[in-house]
């Protein structure tokens, strides 16, 4: 297993609709034809997998059904979008990239993107 550099933004603020997008960029040492991207969430020293996708050459990542992630790729950049976020989902979202083929296998893990999610205030009842 060889190491690879992965860059991602330090902080992202989710939209009022609970959507957060960020770019995950990896320094590919060669021309990989099969890449696996995994988003991990770290909160309170617990790490959980949010979503993962394997892609080849195309520019749309396909995630498992009911995934909260969508994404596209362009060169060595992956544009990730996480939907349905709520305040309790605030945390560090880490991008993990694996170059699956051809050998050798490379693994890169980003420093994480702190995603802040603020639940929208409910509209006050109107007397009118």
């Amino acid at each position: 297993c060889k190491a690879m550099h992965v860059a991602q933004p330090a902080v992202v603020l989710a939209s009022s609709r609970g959507i957060a997008s960020f770019v995950c960029e990896y320094a590919s040492p060669g021309k990989a034809t099969e890449v696996r991207v995994t988003v991990l969430r770290q909160a309170d020293s617990q790490v959980t997998e949010v979503c993962a996708a394997t892609y080849m050459m195309g520019n749309e990542l396909t995630f498992l059904d009911d995934s909260i992630c969508t994404g596209t790729s362009s060169g060595n950049q992956v544009n990730l979008t996480i939907q349905g976020l709520r305040a309790m989902d605030t945390g560090l979202y880490i991008c993990k990239v694996e170059l699956m083929y051809p050998p050798p296998y490379y693994l890169g893990i980003g420093n994480g993107t702190q995603i802040y999610v603020i639940d929208p205030e409910p509209c006050p009842d109107s007397d009118f």
Epitope: T33, M57, G58, E60, M100
Partner: antibody, heavy 115, light 106 residues
Amino acid sequence: QVQLVQSGAEVKKPGASVKVSCKASGYTFTSYWINWVRQAPGQGLEWMGRIAPGSGTTYYNEMFTGRVTMTRDTSTSTVYMELSSLRSEDTAVYYCAIGDYFDYWGQGTMVTVSS
Amino acid sequence: DIQLTQSPSFLSASVGDRVTITCSASKSVSYIHWYQQKPGKAPKLLIYDTSTLASGVPSRFSGSGSGTEFTLTISSLQPEDFATYYCQQRTTYPLTFGQGTKLEIK
């Protein structure tokens, strides 16, 4: 030019298995997904699954889980799709198609399941 | 699974007509891709990533949309356009196709 050549038509009995091959040429075999799609007579298209020819990574449509197996032979640039426990509803034309965009398709293999 | 519903399922039109086929997704998708299939033939990629024409596809074909609503438009029907059209999503597994729209000569 890119070509996908599939094996010939098959007639099978219910409960049997069928193995369809798809031989690729004209491009780098390990660079693109190979997808399998079937089409029952007079019906629409149904995605069965895909395989990454380099690593052998597979994704299957859960509708076929336990019945479908996709494999590849990189030495001959050939992908195989095996469907087991056949039933009459599996009578269809089976296509292989390459790439994320299903850019190129094989000519199709007619599989008939009949007692 | 993401369901794709095409409308109409059947469409009768004449050469020179402008026709629009709609593809509605049960959940938001990143892109929609369109295929054309003629009887006894394998499907052919027509439009990918919602609006990009595949190589060799005439400019009378166009695609648009986002989220859950997408359309395929043929600006001026030609005799060779009478076929069945399918939309497809690959945002999530399993990849799914619409049920198809059969375009027939009026």
